[in-house]
Amino acid sequence: LEVQVPEDPVVALVGTDATLCCSFSPEPGFSLAQLNLIWQLTDTKQLVHSFAEGQDQGSAYANRTALFPDLLAQGNASLRLQRVRVADEGSFTCFVSIRDFGSAAVSLQVAAPYSKPSMTLEPNKDLRPGDTVTITCSSYRGYPEAEVFWQDGQGVPLTGNVTTSQMANEQGLFDVHSVLRVVLGANGTYSCLVRNPVLQQDAHGSVTITGQPMTFP
C-alpha cells in the first residue's frame, strides 16, 4: 500500500494549527470499516492519533490532534495538529493498514518570527570619535535559533568583536542578544539584522551616532 506524504517539512508557526498531510489511494473493496490508521512520533513511537474499526479512536497527544473524518474514505489520512508548540517539532509517521500495510513519515518544522530588534548603547552619552562603544541588539521570542548579522552605514559587514547569545524561554522560544564592540568614527550607522532561517524573515534594527545627539530610528 503506497502512503504519500510531502517530501518537504511542514512549517508551522507557534500557536497556529498545522496539517500533516498523508494520503493513500482507495482500492476496490476498501471501506472505512477495514481501515486502521495510526499516527505516531517517529522516534519515540508515542501514539498520537488513531482510527480503527470504523471509529476515530481520538487523540493520544494532549487532545490537540484531529483527523478529517469526511475525507478519510477518500484516502485522506491527514492529521490536524492544533496550537503548535516548539516541543511538537519532529517527525510524525502515518501508518495505514487496509488489506496491505504502508507507512511514511512527515517532518514538522516549528517556527516563530523574531521581534523587531531593540538597540542599546553603552556608554550612551558624551561619546567622541575614537571611543569604544558596546551596541546591543536584542530580539525576542523567535524559533529556531536566529542568524545575526551586523553592518555599517555603507553596508559593509562587521564580523569582528561580535558576541551573540541565544537563550530559550520556558516555551522553547529564543531571545537573542548580540553585542557589537566598535570604535566610533566621526559619525556612523550600525545595523543589526536578525534572520529566522526557516521563515526567511529578517528583522532590522539600527542606531545612528552623530557625535551629539544620537538617534535611534
Epitope: E2, S25, P26, G29, Q34, Q74
Partner: antibody, heavy 119, light 110 residues
Framework: EVQLLESGGGLVQPGGSLRLSCAAS????????MNWVRQAPGKGLEWVAG????????YHTDSVKGRFTISRDNSKNTLYLQMNSLRAEDAAVYYC????????????WGQGTTVTVSS | QSVLTQPPSASGTPGQRVTISCSGS????????VNWYQQLPGTAPKLLIY???QRPSGVPDRFSGSKSGTSASLAISGLQSEDEADYYC???????????FGGGTKLTVL
Amino acid sequence: EVQLLESGGGLVQPGGSLRLSCAASGLTFSSYAMNWVRQAPGKGLEWVAGIGGSGSSTYHTDSVKGRFTISRDNSKNTLYLQMNSLRAEDAAVYYCAKEDHWSGGMDVWGQGTTVTVSS
Amino acid sequence: QSVLTQPPSASGTPGQRVTISCSGSTSNIGYNLVNWYQQLPGTAPKLLIYTNAQRPSGVPDRFSGSKSGTSASLAISGLQSEDEADYYCAAWDGNLNSWVFGGGTKLTVL
C-alpha cells in the same frame, strides 16, 4: 449529483477489440476506486475489473485476464476498459460503478453500454 | 457458478416478510463486508444495503440486512409490488482479489 456515462459499446466480431469509456462528473474522481461490472442477457451480475483511485493498482477477474485492461485518466475524469480478443461469452451490458468507501459498496452506477460479439 | 450462493427465486404476497440468503466463505463474507443490490427490470443495479446491515438514504426501513459467519441475509418486510426485482449479494474476496456476486434472486410479488 454524481453521474457516470458509459460509451463505446457496439457490435464486434469474435477476436476483435473495443474500448469502453465511462465519463464521471460531480465528484473528485481520483478519490474513488472504480469498477466495471457486466451482465449477460438474462444472467446475473459479474464483476469484470476494478482500479484504485490513483490508477496504480488494477484487478481483473480470471476470465478476462490478459485480454481486458482497466485504466483511468484522472485528469479527464474518465474510466476505460480496453477489451481485446473478444469472445461470444463477453457479450453483455457493461456497467461502470463507483465505490463509496464509507459504505464499501458500489453506490453509483452508469446506465450501461451494450457489447455484442457476433460474426 | 457464482462464488456466493443465492436461491434463484423467492416470492411472497403483499405485506408478507421475505428473506433471501447468501452463502459464501471465509475469504469473502467471513472476512469482509456484505452489500446487497436491487435491480428493477430494465434498469441498472442500485445499492440497497451496505456494510452488512446499513441502508443508504432513501431506502425504506422495510429492507434490512444481517451477517453471521460466512452467510448473510436480506429481509424485506411489508412486501410491496414495487419490490419485484432481482436482488444480488456481493462481497470483496481477499483470496481472489475481486468483487464476487451471488447469482441473484428473482423476487416475485404474488
